[in-house]
């Protein structure tokens, strides 16, 4: 009975999410393998988040709006491990917008989800950020490593969206 009611609940939750995401990829987790964590297909998952690499070239504002429509934000990178996971799926000759910007040009960088900007957990390329005119951050491959660079916000780039996993 307990298992049956849990399955019914899951099915109704899945139906609820189906109107937003036509397909979900779910894995069982938790100590009793009773919880399912899901990401929209074909998003990738890492820890408690789902990631989507958009190859559509758009400005920073349009990229953030695009993520928002999908229930996500431009990516907020919190750890080196997270960045290493993300960069596995990126092309080394491309640049991708992050959810990091400095809208007033005061070098007060801010994440789209209001996560505090911690200077100790940043991965700027050497010498970056280097221009108050360049108010949006990308991640790109330079000098044999992935790192961040400040760029003009209106220049179209690819982007990375991030959302919390869906638990059912």
């Amino acid at each position: 009975n307990f298992m049956y009611s849990k399955t019914v609940k899951r099915l109704s939750k899945l139906q609820e999410y189906q109107q937003y995401y036509p397909s979900l990829t779910c894995v069982m987790e938790g100590k009793d393998m009773e919880d399912w964590s899901c990401c929209p297909t074909p998003w990738t998952s890492f820890q408690s988040s789902c990631y989507f690499i958009s190859t559509v070239m758009q400005s920073w504002t349009k990229s953030q709006n695009n993520c928002s429509v999908m229930g996500a934000d431009l990516v907020v990178i919190n750890t080196k491990e997270e960045q290493d996971f993300i960069t596995q799926n990126l092309k080394i000759n491309s640049a991708y917008f992050l959810g990091l910007s400095d809208p007033k040009g005061w070098r007060h960088w801010q994440w789209v989800d209001q996560t505090p900007y911690n200077k100790n957990v940043t991965f700027w390329h050497s010498g970056e950020p280097n221009s108050p005119d360049e108010r949006c951050a990308i991640i790109n491959f330079r000098s044999e490593e992935w790192g961040w660079n400040d760029v003009h916000c209106h220049v179209p780039q690819k982007s990375i969206c991030k959302m919390k996993k869906i638990y059912i």
Epitope: Q58, S59, W60, T61, K62, Q64, N65, S101, P103, K104, G105, N130, S131, P132, D133, E134, R135, C136, V151, H152, C153, H154, V155, P156
Partner: antibody
Framework: EVQLLESGGGLVQPGGSLRLSCAAS????????MSWVRQAPGKGLEWVAT????????YYPDSVKGRFTISRDNSKNTLYLQMNSLRAEDTAVYYC??????????????WGQGTTVTVSS | DIVLTQSPDSLAVSLGERATINCKAS??????????VNWYQQKPGQPPKLLIY???NLESGIPDRFSGSGSGTDFTLTISSLQAEDVAVYYC?????????FGGGTKVEIK
């Protein structure tokens, strides 16, 4: 007073090359992103190129990409536009302008008087 | 590319009367409460001059008879009381996304 003085325009044959210069004074040139905008005779305005203050990032519309190169020499307070493989439709007055950011966008706040480029055989 | 369509193409207004110019974008140029549309004035034989930025902010040194309004895709430049020195072509421009694009221009003349 901000002054932007373009030079280098002239008559050139299709397929030819030309280098425009823009000498800036009255601003700390090395801190400014700069742009070129053109205006064909009797027509509207068209953005041509932008370069950031350090000169390491450049941007172009598809209409000139691969043919035009924007560059700068901050020690000389000068902006350049190298134009190759010129076409009749590149005939225009070319203006240099300073770029001022506005949140996630920008404005072109100071403009030079322009230099005329004519591409004709 | 974002297309900006200005209307009318030309406008004849009596001295002291109001002039209104419209600019329609092919997609929204707003983000987080700001609109990325600017207005420029170009007099014959002169370079363009910035009047309004961010849809409604008056550039320093521009007379306050000029004003801008609008958001999303629809924007307006208003000259509240036309003066002889306002005879010019007016252009809207978007800076939300490259390539920056300009409207086709509106020629303002005195009736």
């Amino acid at each position: 007073e901000v002054q932007l003085l373009e030079s280098g325009g002239g008559l050139v044959q299709p397929g030819g090359s030309l280098r425009l210069s823009c000498a800036a004074s009255g601003i700390t040139f090395s801190t400014y992103t700069m742009s070129w905008v053109r205006q064909a005779p009797g027509k509207g305005l068209e953005w041509v190129a932008t370069i950031n203050s350090g000169g390491d990032n450049t941007y172009y519309p598809d209409s000139v990409k691969g043919r035009f190169t924007i560059s700068r020499d901050n020690s000389k307070n000068t902006l350049y536009l190298q134009m190759n493989s010129l076409r009749a439709e590149d005939t225009a007055v070319y203006y240099c302008a300073t770029y001022r950011p506005y949140y996630y966008g920008s404005v072109l706040d100071y403009w030079g008087q322009g230099t005329t480029v004519t591409v004709s055989s | 590319d974002i297309v900006l369509t200005q209307s009318p193409d030309s406008l004849a207004v009596s001295l002291g009367e109001r002039a209104t110019i419209n600019c329609k974008a092919s997609q929204s140029v707003d983000y987080d409460g700001n609109s990325y549309v600017n207005w420029y004035q170009q007099k014959p034989g002169q370079p363009p001059k910035l009047l309004i930025y961010g849809a409604s902010n008056l550039e320093s040194g521009i007379p306050d008879r000029f004003s801008g309004s609008g958001s999303g895709t629809d924007f307006t430049l208003t000259i509240s009381s036309l003066q002889a020195e306002d005879v010019a072509v007016y252009y809207c421009q978007q800076s939300d996304e490259d390539p920056w694009t300009f409207g086709g221009g509106t020629k303002v003349e005195i009736k």
